[in-house]
Amino acid sequence: GSTVPPMVNVTCSEVSEGNITVTCRASSFYPRNITLTWRQDGVSLSHNTQQWGDVLPDGNGTYQTWVATRIRQGEEQRFTCYMEHSGNHGTHPVPSGNSHHHHHHHH
């Protein structure tokens, strides 16, 4: 089938002691091969500080996956989610302030 670019969605959830978990979800993409990673100051985070979900079918002939990491509250602007899929790439910031969701569709 033809390439379907992912929808990328970055969310934050509060956790204890001034830390938050940021999750980057990629959905509705095809083919299933994708790179999704968190970067701190432009440099990819070590693998042992990130958690990845499996790349799973989402029921529409496309796929979905996610990557998460824990960061200190107030340092959101230093982290970005980097996505590569079928030759396309994109960088997605962590939403700042009270805005806890960010969606972007790649073309």
Epitope: Q40, D41, G42, V43, S44, H89, T91
Partner: antibody, heavy 121, light 108 residues
């Protein structure tokens, strides 16, 4: 003014060890990632190692992995490079360089004057 | 690791001449993570072009950068004496980070 001052270089025998230091001043050290970059005599730049501001992310060049250890002491504004099993090819000027973050762009914006390490018998 | 090979290694250019050097990567690099640095003898490197095509502060407009994927280039539109230096490309798309082999530009 931002200042990075390296020290600890000198003459070391092959197989020996050395610890380089980089003393930082003029900025909030604990908020910047720092790299070590080296330059052998009459050669190009070679990236050596990186440590993020919070020591969470550390990377090494393949040529030094397993032999060199980068670390930092934020309260003392100091970066370190512990080098073991030194080889003649480690002979170089060693620079520490600050990793800036501005408007979503990251780059080396300040460098020390370097410290020279010579590995020779 | 991503190896960056620069060509030519050394080049001589006359004043006013157009100069182009290339940086070739062994695997794809996002343009956001590809910078160029200028280094003169006895000095530390300076950021020259960032994210493939953006001039750093203070860099003359005669410089330009372009490229994508595995091939990038730096061009000096009209060579001036102060441009004599060594230029390095640098990638942080993937770890380990790497510098290019360098292109030394001399005055003919």
């Amino acid at each position: 003014d931002v200042q990075l001052v390296e020290s600890g270089g000198g003459l070391v025998q092959p197989g020996g060890s050395r610890k380089l230091s980089c003393a930082a001043s003029g900025f909030t050290f604990s908020t910047f990632g720092i790299h070590w970059v080296r330059q052998a005599p009459e050669k190009g730049l070679e990236w050596v190692a990186y440590i993020s501001y919070d020591s969470r992310t550390i990377y090494y060049a393949d040529t030094v992995k397993g032999r060199f250890t980068i670390s930092r002491d934020n309260p003392k504004n100091t970066l370190f490079l512990q080098m073991t099993s030194l080889r003649s090819e480690d002979t170089a000027m060693y620079y520490c360089a600050r990793w800036a973050y501005e408007g979503g762009v990251n780059y080396f914006d300040n460098w020390g004057q370097g410290t020279t390490l010579t590995v020779s018998s | 690791q991503i190896v960056l090979t620069q060509s030519p290694a050394i080049m001589s250019a006359s004043l006013g001449e157009r100069v182009t050097m290339t940086c070739t990567a062994t695997s794809g690099v996002s343009s956001s993570y590809l910078h160029w640095y200028q280094q003169k003898p006895g000095s530390s490197p300076k950021l020259w072009i960032y994210s493939s095509s953006n001039l750093a502060s203070g860099v003359p407009a005669r410089f330009s950068g372009s490229g994508s994927g595995t091939s990038y280039s730096l061009t000096i539109g009209s060579m001036e004496a102060e441009d004599a230096a060594t230029y390095y490309c640098h990638q942080f798309h993937r770890s380990p980070l790497t510098f290019g082999t360098g292109t030394k530009v001399e005055i003919k």
